[in-house]
């Protein structure tokens, strides 16, 4: 008996071939001997089976001695043995219909779990293997679970169902809802405008929800909500914003915030959360602000940074085109009695400059100039 695997909701074509290459009488029946369809001359006739409105054939093949049974919009309960009767012969085909579905929405938040459930006909014992977009293989029986979804899990999951040495392939598109970056750092000189961007790692037709940016300034004892906003069909509207700092927010995606001035009291880290409509849980992105200030007071040239810097970062003070006068893994460095010239304060990581501030030291009889 020939075995054919089908997919729920799909179309399957069961073949039946006569030895004579001409149109002759045929009919298809199910295992209960109920007629599904057949022909009368060059016309299709249908029986009283439950497949009535979903069964069809191809007249164009009849002349070649081929009498297919097409079943559209397959259901699990269509799994059965189908019998083709032609030329006093009987051809049997066993059809097994499988369905594979994500038991939750296919749009999942980063860190959530994905469960795939296999629907199969009674008496079948299929095995399932799924391959994620990043090439990770998972195997299982009736259910497959993947916990802690990551951004790289977004895309098409290809699942193969194996039964009787035959296979049927399912493709399920999964969208992991997350920000493109989990964390980012912005380095700014005091007084500069600061731009924070929170690009999403997915695109959907309609995006609705609400969000908030909480800020923990390095100098403050507790965190504070800087801004709250709503998102409606990808349009951003501010609900509430603090007076200090007075943040501005872009009206369109990607989420974009502007801080008019980088000041030491703002240096610190923030957490932007986004709650999406009809989703449990929130998307998070951490953002950090490091602010640099270079000053000269009397005979002391000082460079300071505020905000979350890693211990391996180097802070240096150097006269232009000369070796660094002072270089430390600290958040403040100074030079006493600096000679005249253009001094550079540099924050660097393994030789790569992250932030630079210049200050002009004038001869001792004049006042310093900060460009």
């Amino acid at each position: 008996k020939k075995v054919v695997l089908g997919k729920k909701g799909d179309t399957v074509e069961l073949t039946c071939t006569a030895s004579q290459k001409k149109s002759i009488q045929f009919h298809w029946k199910n295992s209960n001997q109920i007629k599904i369809l057949g022909n009368q001359g060059s016309f299709l006739t249908k029986g009283p089976s439950k497949l009535n409105d979903r069964a069809d054939s191809r007249r164009s093949l009849w002349d070649q001695g081929n009498f297919p049974l097409i079943i559209k919009n397959l259901k699990i309960e269509d799994s059965d043995t189908y019998i083709c009767e032609v030329e006093d012969q009987k051809e049997e085909v066993q059809l097994l219909v499988f369905g594979l579905t994500a038991n939750s929405d296919t749009h999942l938040l980063q860190g959530q779990s994905l469960t795939l459930t296999l629907e199969s006909p009674p008496g079948s014992s299929p095995s399932v293997q799924c391959r994620s977009p990043r090439g990770k293989n998972i195997q299982g029986g009736k259910t497959l679970s993947v916990s802690q979804l990551e951004l790289q899990d977004s895309g098409t999951w290809t699942c193969t169902v194996l039964q009787n040495q035959k296979k049927v392939e399912f493709k399920i598109d999964i969208v992991v809802l997350a920000f493109q970056k989990a964390s980012s750092i912005v380095y700014k000189k005091e007084g500069e405008q600061v731009e924070f961007s929170f690009p999403l790692a997915f695109t959907v037709e309609k995006l609705t929800g609400s969000g908030e940016l909480w800020w923990q300034a390095e100098r403050a004892s507790s965190s504070k909500s800087w801004i709250t906003f709503d998102l409606k069909n990808k349009e951003v509207s501010v609900k509430r914003v603090t007076q200090d700092p007075k943040l501005q927010m872009g009206k369109k995606l990607p989420l974009h915030l502007t801080l008019p001035q980088a000041l030491p009291q703002y240096a610190g880290s923030g957490n932007l959360t986004l709650a999406l409509e009809a989703k449990t849980g929130k998307l998070h992105q951490e953002v950090n602000l490091v602010v640099m200030r270079a000053t000269q007071l009397q005979k002391n040239l000082t460079c300071e940074v505020w905000g979350p810097t890693s211990p391996k970062l180097m802070l240096s003070l150097k006269l232009e085109n000369k070796e660094a006068k002072v270089s430390k893994r600290e958040k403040a460095v100074w030079v006493l009695n600096p000679e005249a010239g253009m001094w550079q304060c540099l924050l660097s990581d393994s030789g790569q400059v992250l932030l630079e501030s210049n200050i002009k030291v004038l001869p001792t009889w004049s006042t310093p100039v900060q460009p």
Partner: antibody, heavy 121, light 107 residues
Framework: QVQLVQSGAEVKKPGASVKVSCKAS????????IHWVRQAPGQGLEWMGW????????HYAQKFQGRVTMTRDTSTSTVYMELSSLRSEDTAVYYC??????????????WGQGTLVTVSS | DIQMTQSPSSLSASVGDRVTITCRAS??????LAWYQQKPGKAPKLLIY???TLQSGVPSRFSGSGSGTDFTLTISSLQPEDFATYYC?????????FGQGTRLEIK
């Protein structure tokens, strides 16, 4: 949604062969026959044949028998139509189309965007 | 091969007009007939199949009738987007054949 995306325009010399591809998406590739239909400039439509992507079975119009070959690659959900011994009258836009079957008859429900094949010396 | 003949081969009409295109088969094809619309530089689009069944998504101003050898496509009230070329096609016997087309132009 069902999409059939065809390969780009080709210019060929008489006597040469051309191979046009048609990549299907949005449906189970092996479940529907793909037909090829051509249209000469300013002319009507002409059916060339079909391929059953499930088993690779083909049926060609008598007119193209011996000159046309239809193949498929299930791993990429792509169907190919190769026409050999090209002549100037083969200059046409070649379309692939996915059929639908209703009451045992076949109709062309979804079409590719077409591929212009120009045969010129 | 079954020959399909359309008439007229071209037709001028105005928005709001009722238009009828006919298609004749060289032999009985029962109701195994389809109508397609094609706009310049585009692929054909299935409008009607089985002589009178409207394909999903096609406006109800399009209708088809006939059986045997004579068929008609009617557009009850022409819209600007309906100006195109229309083809009939028989699905009775291989090779499937098309009519030569009817070009519908704005008057």
């Amino acid at each position: 949604q069902v999409q059939l995306v065809q390969s780009g325009a080709e210019v060929k010399k008489p006597g040469a062969s051309v191979k046009v591809s048609c990549k299907a998406s949005g449906h189970t590739f092996t479940s529907y026959y793909i037909h090829w239909v051509r249209q000469a400039p300013g002319q009507g439509l002409e059916w060339m044949g079909w391929i059953n992507p499930n088993n690779g079975g083909t049926h060609y119009a008598q007119k193209f028998q011996g000159r046309v070959t239809m193949t498929r690659d299930t791993s990429t959900s792509t169907v190919y139509m190769e026409l050999s011994s090209l002549r100037s009258e083969d200059t046409a836009v070649y379309y692939c189309a996915r059929d639908m079957v209703r009451d045992s008859a076949e109709y062309f429900q979804h079409w590719g965007q077409g591929t212009l094949v120009t045969v010129s010396s | 091969d079954i020959q399909m003949t359309q008439s007229p081969s071209s037709l001028s009409a105005s928005v709001g007009d009722r238009v009828t295109i006919t298609c004749r088969a060289s032999e009985d094809i029962s109701t195994y007939l389809a109508w397609y619309q094609q706009k310049p530089g585009k692929a054909p689009k299935l409008l009607i199949y089985a002589a009178s069944t409207l394909q999903s998504g096609v406006p109800s101003r399009f209708s088809g009738s006939g059986s045997g050898t004579d068929f008609t496509l009617t557009i009850s009230s022409l819209q600007p987007e309906d100006f195109a070329t229309y083809y009939c096609q028989q699905s009775h016997t291989i090779p499937w054949t098309f009519g030569q087309g009817t070009r519908l132009e704005i008057k």
